[in-house]
């Protein structure tokens, strides 16, 4: 009888085992395990009748189509075999075991005890056949295996071969190289590659196969396995295969498709081709006079571009438009896109106007073309060129006037400072009282009028200031502070400030320049209790024109010591003290409550310690700080007073031969102005030079070298 076994393991015994088996018996065991496994059979006990070639009793092990072993006896002899330690391994997943005993047994034979089990087949080691083995990588697992591919490859639907995705290759450059995947290594199997060359209309693609050409072929049938086909419009060239490359191909088209097919077998190295665009030829070009063409070639074809440029100092002129370069292109019909332009000499045109300056031409006929020269100069003596610049500008190749230091920037004509049009009196002789100032003696002197019309009654007061530049006035902070607030320092509104310059006699304002304020800047640390940091600036709405009666004063160098004791300085002012005078009266009527004509006084700087002591000896908390200095005479008689507030205390600098503002009229008291041992207190300007420059937005180097000692 037959026993069907489907387990992954099991035991087979002869009938009656462990007793002796019966005579004339036949049993077949058919063992089937899943695919991917084979069957291993071994015997733990074996005792059968022995016979020549196992004719009587035997155990036969076989598969569907072959006998794997026949066993009998008790021990192995030349003609019969017992399994002993031997293991029988099926080649596949099926094994049949047949036990047969003949009709007579002279002895009692105990038969056999066998065991079987399913064992995994390592397909990766055992597959020899290329048709079945993995193309790249094989991975065994219990009961089966699977294939995978190298990076860049995709497993084919046959789950065995590795192909590439190569159907989306677009080439748009005018030249290029195309190869089979992985060239020069063998190309992948089971792949369909598509290469598209798509150039601009007007080009024609030429193909040339190079180096190795190795595509699997067949001795009789043309290219049945792997091949290249070239599709040009409706026309198909090929298939091509084997080891001989096709001849160069002129497609006469701007669009070409290359198809490459590989089947699932073979190891061939593939192919490489280069393509090149060909186009119509354009006529030879002649460069313009004073110009050149780049690139310079013997021949130019469709899509070639040339750049026309001119020699230094010349510009490309095309249709009356000047440009640096001009590009023309060879068109598909073999003509140039434009005519060659001409080269025209660069013209810098009329140079820019210089504020407070003039221009002279160095070149004849006032030429403004390349390499022409001009010279800027400032309106002397009121303006001086910043940094002593030469003012010489040359017409550059770029068409702009260029200076060696400033480049294309115009020079700056800075107001000359501290140089009155009229000489101030000698300081050798001491002047006891104030005296009238001649016009032009204090050209920096400003009258500041503050008139607050926002309240009833209108509030108004006056002070002095000093012109620092065409746009800035230096004064004392207390002049520009609203007294309505005491616990906080609030500047007056700029709308309420008017500045008069070039004013000599307040009865005659015709020659004066009046300006409104664009900004009022009080020193941020101004202290109303002790007048420390009593300094402020007014920016004028418009720069004022400079002249003999309106010129700035120089700022000192930054020096904490300030002016030296006993040095003589001058202060000017109108000494306005009557509050009940209208602005119109002040400016035009020349009322008797103030000086009609600008007054000035000559005062010595008082040693700091002496001044401090003189104020400390008075009742009250007067403090003469390091930001102040004093000037005046012990015996009194000359002093500055209320309306002079903010006015400049100037000292002549011998080295630069200029007048420098060292102080601003700040405070004094408690006795009347000009009293004995009541020195006037002045803001020490040299402590604030950096702050002043910062507010004015000018570099410190602008004027400072002019007052170096």
């Amino acid at each position: 009888h037959t026993v069907e076994l489907n387990n992954m393991f099991g035991q087979i015994q002869s009938p009656g085992y462990p007793d002796s088996y019966p005579s004339d018996s036949e049993v077949t065991w058919n063992i089937t395990v899943p695919d991917g496994f084979r069957i291993k059979l071994y015997f733990m006990h074996f005792n059968l009748e022995s016979s020549y070639l196992c004719e009587y009793d035997y155990v036969k092990v076989e598969t569907e189509d072959q006998v794997l072993a026949t066993f009998c006896g008790r021990e192995t002899t030349d003609t019969e075999q017992t399994p002993g330690q031997e293991v029988v391994l099926s080649p596949g997943s099926f094994m049949s075991i047949t036990f047969r005993s003949d009709f007579s047994n002279e002895e009692r034979f105990t038969g056999f005890d066998a065991h079987y089990m399913a064992v995994d087949v390592d397909e990766c080691k055992e597959r020899e056949d290329e048709e079945l083995s993995c193309d790249h990588y094989c991975h065994n697992y219990i009961g089966g295996y699977y294939c995978s591919c190298r990076f860049g490859y995709i497993l084919h639907t046959d789950n065995r071969t590795c192909r590439v995705e190569c159907s989306d290759n677009l080439f748009t450059q005018r030249t290029g190289v195309i190869t089979s995947p992985d060239f020069p290594n063998p190309y992948p199997k089971s792949s369909e590659c598509l290469y598209t060359i798509e150039l601009e209309e007007g080009f024609m693609v030429n193909l040339q196969f190079e180096d190795i050409f190795d595509i699997e072929d067949h001795p009789e049938v043309p290219c049945p396995y792997d091949y290249i086909k070239i599709k040009v419009g409706p026309k198909v060239l090929g298939p091509f295969c084997g080891e001989k490359a096709p001849e160069p191909i002129s497609t006469q088209s701007h669009s070409v498709l290359i198809l490459f097919h590989s089947d699932n077998s073979g190891e061939n190295r593939g192919w490489r081709l280069s393509y090149r665009a060909a186009g119509n030829e354009c006529p030879e070009l002649q460069p313009p006079v004073h110009g050149k063409i780049e690139p310079s070639q013997a021949k130019y074809f469709f899509k070639d571009q040339v750049l026309v440029s001119c020699d230094t100092g010349y510009k490309v002129l095309k249709d009356n438009v000047e440009m640096d370069t001009f590009q023309i292109e060879c068109l598909k019909d073999g003509t140039w896109s434009n005519k060659i332009p001409t080269c025209k000499i660069v013209d810098c045109r009329a140079p820019g106007e210089l504020e407070h300056g003039l221009i002279t031409f160095s070149t004849r006929n006032n030429l403004t073309t390349y390499k022409s020269e001009i010279k800027y100069s400032c309106q002397e003596p009121y303006y001086k060129m910043l940094n002593n610049n030469t003012g010489i500008y040359t017409c550059s190749a770029q068409g702009v006037w260029m200076n060696k230091v400033l480049g294309r920037s115009l020079p700056t004509c800075l107001p000359e400072c501290g140089q009155p049009s009229r000489s101030l009196p000698s300081l050798v002789k001491r002047i006891i009282g104030g005296r009238n100032a001649e016009p032009g003696l204090f050209p920096w002197q400003a009258l500041i009028v503050v008139e607050d019309t926002s309240r009833v009654p209108n509030d108004k007061w006056f002070g002095s200031g000093a012109l620092l530049s065409a746009s800035w006035i230096l004064t004392a902070a207390h002049v520009l502070r609203s007294q309505r607030r005491d616990t906080t320092v609030i500047p007056v509104s700029k709308e309420h400030v008017t500045v008069y310059l070039g004013l000599h006699d307040v009865r005659d304002k015709s020659g004066a320049v009046n300006s409104s304020a664009a900004r009022v800047v009080l020193h941020p640390d101004f202290n109303i209790q002790n007048y420390n940091h009593d300094i402020a600036l007014v920016q004028l709405q418009e720069p004022v024109p400079l002249g003999p009666h309106v010129m700035p004063v120089c700022l000192p160098r930054l020096e904490p010591e300030g002016p030296a004791p006993h040095m003589l300085g001058l202060v000017a002012g109108w000494g306005i003290s009557n509050p009940n005078v209208t602005v119109d009266e002040i400016i035009s009527s020349g009322t008797r409550t103030l000086s009609d004509v600008l007054q000035y006084v000559k005062l010595p700087v008082v040693p700091h310690a002496e001044c401090k002591t003189s104020y400390e000896s008075r009742s009250g908390n007067y403090s003469v700080t390091e930001n102040m200095f004093c000037a005046g005479y012990y015996e009194g008689g000359k002093d500055t007073c209320l309306g002079d507030s903010g006015g400049a205390f100037v000292i002549f600098d011998d080295l630069s031969q200029r007048w420098v503002v060292q102080g601003l009229v700040s405070w004094g008291g408690p006795e009347e102005c000009g009293s004995k041992q009541v020195y006037g207190v002045y803001t020490k300007v040299s402590n604030y030079v950096d702050w002043v420059w910062e507010q004015m937005g000018l570099p410190q180097s602008v004027v400072e070298p002019q007052v170096e000692r």
């Epitope: 009654p457 509030d459 007294q483 309505r484 005491d486 616990t487 509050p579 908390n621 209320l642 405070w667």
Partner: antibody, heavy 116, light 112 residues
């Protein structure tokens, strides 16, 4: 030290005038305005106005426009309050106080009595 | 004019105890520059006034730190943490933001 010293008490008949002074010392006089404040007997304080000591311009509260005048003599650092056409209801202590809005230091006060 | 209202109008305090005075204005005292000009002064019996606090909370020099000021907009407070005998008198608040400057009606502080 900062001091405001006012003139002494005044006894005036109705219709007369009076001028009260307030001498300042111990600080930069033109740095601060000067306020005037009235205190009627047993009553609270009432701000009368102030004078800008730099410009000399006075500003009056509405109730004190007309008969009241603030003035200044900068040379002696003294502001003045003058009241004309005195009435019985002007009887009060008048204080000067340093500052337009600060009023950080006060005079000792001047009693003006208006009685027939 | 801005009306300044003080509460209470009188206050009797045991020495060492705290005291608080409120001052309300009829409109905000914050000016366009962001400052609040609210001040407090004390007028002791028979004396001229003396300023204690300015700009809401800043103490004048020489004023003991038991005094403090607070508030914003229209509501302000003067506090005395521990009242002493010398603190008796009339306390006034006043504003210097809106012209004309105006005083509160005063708060009389006396010792129990």
């Amino acid at each position: 030290q900062i001091q405001l010293v006012q003139s002494g008490s005044e006894l005036k008949k109705p219709g007369a005038s009076v001028k009260v002074s307030c001498k300042a010392s111990g600080y930069i006089f033109t740095s601060y305005g000067m306020s005037w404040v009235r205190q009627a007997p047993g009553k609270g304080l009432k701000w009368m106005g102030w004078i800008n000591t730099y410009s000399g311009v006075p500003t009056y509260a509405d109730d004190f426009k007309g008969r009241f005048v603030f003035s200044l003599d900068t040379s002696v650092r003294t502001p003045y309050l003058q009241i004309s056409s005195l009435k019985a209801e002007d009887t009060a202590v008048y204080f000067c106080a340093r500052g337009g809005e600060a009023m950080d230091y006060w005079g000792q006060g001047t009693l003006v009595t208006v009685s027939s | 004019d801005v009306l300044m209202t003080q509460t209470p109008l009188s206050l009797s305090v045991t020495p060492g105890q705290p005291a608080s005075i409120s001052c309300k204005s009829s409109q905000s005292l914050l000016d366009s520059a962001g400052k609040t000009y609210l001040n407090w002064l004390l007028q002791r019996p028979g004396q001229s006034p003396k300023r204690l606090i300015y700009l809401v909370s800043k103490l004048d020099s020489g004023v003991p730190d038991r005094f403090s000021g607070s508030g914003s907009g229209t509501d302000f407070t003067l506090k005395i943490s521990r009242v002493e005998a010398e603190d008796v008198g009339v306390y006034y608040c006043w504003q210097g933001t809106h012209f004309p400057w105006t005083f509160g009606q005063g708060t009389k502080v006396e010792i129990k």
